[in-house]
Interface confidence: low
């Protein structure tokens, strides 16, 4: 039979597809279709009736291979809806009414390669929306109302193409979201409510590393007032993100350097593109004889390409490859003479291996950060041993273990924050016994394994805005006995008996050691209540009339999972202390 | 100067396969997309597809999808386009355009490939 | 896709008059459209992009204008090497796509 081709609706066929045309028919019911069987057809119900799709509405139609319901009035789709479509590449939903995506919404659409859901009324995509949709390369969200997307939403979507104009976006941040859109061909983000911040400076950085003709229209700031307008591109990064205070040695600790540009050396193989630097701090008087000095200029052989090199006194060599679409240490050649410090923040390199890094034994600061390194072979730092300060933030380093930091023994300065940390093994930090500051920050750790900090003379520890519900004081916490200062706020804290300890190790510490408060996530009733200010009894009711109870586990394994809420709220809130860019 | 040289013409049968290269240079390389466009004798353009040479990642216009393939070799700053199941419609000339946000800012010679029986 | 309609298909001037090409998309494609140069046995050459801007070298005699679904491209006193087929084509959408040409011949 030739199903609705013979009543309801036109069909043809082309190069050996159905092409069913159902629109405008005034079609309530997508059972009203019938489609003839055993053939690929493309079926547009276009402009029809449609308010709601119901599960197996369209289990009847599973040759289908692309289904148009724009301009229908479809508020709601039940799971299940799609069932049967396995074959489908393309699906339109535009110009309906739809608020939400759920988590599954689009089950059983396992080869869909093109969705469009534009022109709805979207609010809520919820984070597994996608995560089937192994082959989804292009997806139209624009003119909704999207104001947020939850972390990880595209983590096993390969999108080449993403539309997202015309929503009520403010930031993307790098981790759980641009992280995870690295095959993307085209990207179109106008007409958001982009707030100019900190939290910008990741999407800001990300899109400068892209190439530079596949931004489709520009990101324009609605916040804060004085951006209003503005376009994200045209702005300093120093304007969006004014660097703190300046700090010992003249570097704020989120790792941004304070470094005069200095002019491409004469070579026809460089790159042209003189790469801009935060500009100095004012009140940073150790760094500006060597700004006033006439700098040096190395002839060709001595300075990498695609690098700017200036000699530092007395002898050795600031090495600056930033943003220069590297991709491995072994694109540096030739290699250089006694370099001091390599700068090679915000290139493309995804892993670091032994080899790379033998010749640059005389290093005493590698920066690293805002790359795409994922893969550090063990022993890789093994020949630096006069390293003193090394940056890995902005990465997506998953793991640590104690191999990864071999060779280190004079560093004093690790920052790791802004990575996808879940794991540190035991002995991680073992190799680097004059550690005195460490940056865990905005990364996905949930525990620490026992006595990880001892030895380690650390003064300074950052894990603000990780996953942590509880930290053990035993063997952990009570090791660091040089510190001055801890951030912990930011994390799903669990206020329950297991936080006693480190309430009580909280009071013992001096007023300005902890630098924020530590808020309560659960249980509900003390959600955003502060750790210190709760009574002993609260987080931990009959503690006092059962004294053998303990307080602390020593090593923790927090099971729970990481919610969806916390992660969103916690690892994805973006950068309020400025990513290390430079 | 930026230019993009395209390989030899071609003629094949029906049923055959064809690889076009372009080779860039006069710029980075990884920093511009690179698009296919074709033009059959005495039609207008048409525009068949577009790869990323840092990444590599393609997306092709949907009447080719299945038939078409673009690949890049960053060591020469080529790229590649292959045809397969080439058909007489096919006849034409296949151009290379270095992409500039979705417009097409420079454009190899061309190379004409011609399926014939 | 975006369908994209250009008139007339052939315009027949003289030098130093005076051309308006016309160019209508299906819908809406805001200011992202270009227009192209190709004369014959040459590749096309860029010459408008995003309605109204010229790209680099080329000359002040062309001119584009238009938003929305409806474009036009002035050249505002013809030469004789401007006589050849002009394309517009639309980046608004994938897949990018090109009107069918306008000839400029010589009357």
């Known amino acids: 039979s030739r199903g609705s081709c013979d009543s309801l609706c036109n069909c043809e066929e082309k190069d050996g597809t159905m092409l069913i045309n159902c629109e405008a028919k005034g079609i309530k019911m997508v059972s009203e279709i019938s489609v003839p069987p055993s053939r690929p057809f493309q079926l547009s119900l276009l402009n029809n009736g449609l308010t709601m799709l119901h599960t197996n509405d369209f289990s009847g139609l599973t040759n289908a291979i692309s289904i148009h319901l724009g301009f229908n009035n479809i508020a709601d789709i039940e799971i299940g809806a799609f069932n049967g479509l396995g074959l489908l590449k393309q699906l339109h939903i535009n110009h309906n009414s739809l608020e939400i995506l759920k988590e599954d919404t689009f089950h059983g659409l396992e080869n869909l390669e093109f969705l469009q859901a534009d022109n709805n009324f979207i609010t809520v995509i919820e984070p597994s929306a996608f995560s089937k949709l192994n082959r989804l390369k292009v997806l139209i969200l624009n003119d909704n109302a999207i104001e947020s997307l939850p972390p990880n939403i595209f983590r096993f979507v390969p999108l080449t193409h993403l539309d997202l104009r015309g929503n009520q976006l403010q930031t993307l941040p790098y981790v759980g979201f641009l992280e995870h859109i690295g095959r993307i061909l085209d990207l179109q983000l106008e007409d958001n409510k982009w707030a100019c911040n900190c939290d910008l400076l990741q999407l800001k950085t990300w899109l400068e590393n892209m190439p530079p003709q596949s931004i489709i229209g520009d990101v324009v700031c609605n916040s804060p007032p004085f951006f209003k307008g503005s376009i994200l591109s045209r702005l300093k990064k120093e304007s969006i993100c004014p660097t703190p205070p300046v700090y010992e040695e003249h570097e704020d600790p989120s790792g941004s350097l304070h470094l005069a540009a200095t002019s491409s050396i004469n070579d026809s193989r460089m790159s042209t593109k003189t790469t801009s630097i935060l500009k100095l701090p004012t009140k940073a008087p150790g760094l500006i004889p060597y700004i006033t000095k006439p700098s040096t200029q190395l002839p060709g052989p001595y300075c990498p390409i695609p690098c700017n090199c200036k000699v530092l006194s007395p002898s050795g060599l600031l090495i600056h490859c930033q943003e220069r679409n590297i991709e491995s240490l072994s694109d540096l050649r030739p290699p250089p003479q006694n370099p001091r410090k390599l700068i090679l923040a915000g290139n493309i390199i995804h892993s670091l291996m032994k080899s790379d890094l033998v010749e640059y034994f005389t290093l005493e600061m590698l920066h690293l950060g805002n790359n795409r390194i994922e893969v550090l072979e063990e022993g890789s730092f093994m020949n630096l041993t006069r390293l003193q300060k090394l940056y890995l933030n902005g990465n997506h380093l998953t793991k640590l273990s104690k191999g990864m930091f071999l060779g280190l023994h004079n560093l004093e300065y690790l920052y790791l924050e802004y990575n996808a940390i879940k794991e540190i093994l035991p002995g991680t930090f073992n190799p680097m016994p004059k550690l005195k500051v460490l940056y865990l920050n905005n990364n996905l750790l949930q525990v620490l394994p026992p006595h990880i900090f001892s030895g380690v003379p650390l003064t300074k520890v950052n894990l603000k805005t990780n996953q942590f519900t509880h930290l053990p004081v035993s063997n952990i916490l009570d090791d660091l006995d040089l510190l001055t200062q801890i951030d912990l706020e930011d994390n799903p804290w669990d206020c329950s008996c297991d936080l006693v300890g480190l309430q009580q190790w909280i009071q013992k510490l001096s007023k300005n050691t902890v630098t924020d408060d530590i808020l309560c996530t659960s249980p509900g009733h003390l959600d955003k209540k502060e750790l210190k200010a709760l009574n002993s009894e609260i987080l931990c009711p009959g503690l006092v009339n059962n004294p053998s109870m303990p307080t602390q586990t020593s090593y923790l394994m927090v099971t729970t999972p990481a919610t969806t809420t916390n992660t969103a709220d916690t690892i994805l809130r973006s950068l309020t202390d400025a990513v290390p860019l430079s | 100067q930026v230019q993009l040289v395209q390989s030899g013409a071609e003629v094949k049968k029906p049923g055959a396969s064809v690889k076009v290269s372009c080779k860039a240079s006069?710029?980075?390389?990884?920093?511009?997309?690179m698009h296919w466009v074709r033009q059959a004798p005495g039609q207008g353009l048409e525009w068949m597809g577009i790869i990323n040479p840092s990444g590599g990642s393609t997306s092709y216009a949907q009447k080719f999808q299945g038939r078409v393939t673009m690949t890049r070799d960053t060591s020469t700053s080529t790229v590649y386009m292959e045809l397969s199941s080439l058909r007489s419609e096919d006849t034409a000339v296949y151009y290379c355009?270095?992409?500039?946000?979705?417009?097409?800012?420079?454009w190899g010679q061309g190379t004409l490939v011609t399926v014939s029986a | 896709e975006i369908v994209m309609t250009q008139s007339p298909g052939t315009l027949s001037l003289s030098p130093g008059e005076r051309a308006t090409l016309s160019c209508r998309a299906s819908q809406s494609v805001s200011k992202y459209l270009a227009w192209y140069q190709q004369r014959p046995g040459q590749a096309p050459r860029l010459l408008i992009y995003d309605a109204s801007n010229r790209a680099t070298g080329i000359p002040a005699r062309f001119s584009g204008s238009g938003s929305g679904t409806d474009f036009t491209l002035t050249v505002s006193s013809l030469e004789p090497e401007d006589f050849a087929v002009y394309y517009c084509?639309?980046?608004?959408?994938?897949?990018?796509?090109f009107g069918g040409g306008t000839t400029v011949e010589i009357k």
């Open positions: 355009a270095r992409g500039f946000t979705r417009y097409f800012d420079y």
């Open positions: 006069g710029y980075t390389f990884t920093s511009y997309y």
């Open positions: 084509q639309q980046r608004y959408n994938w897949p990018l796509t």
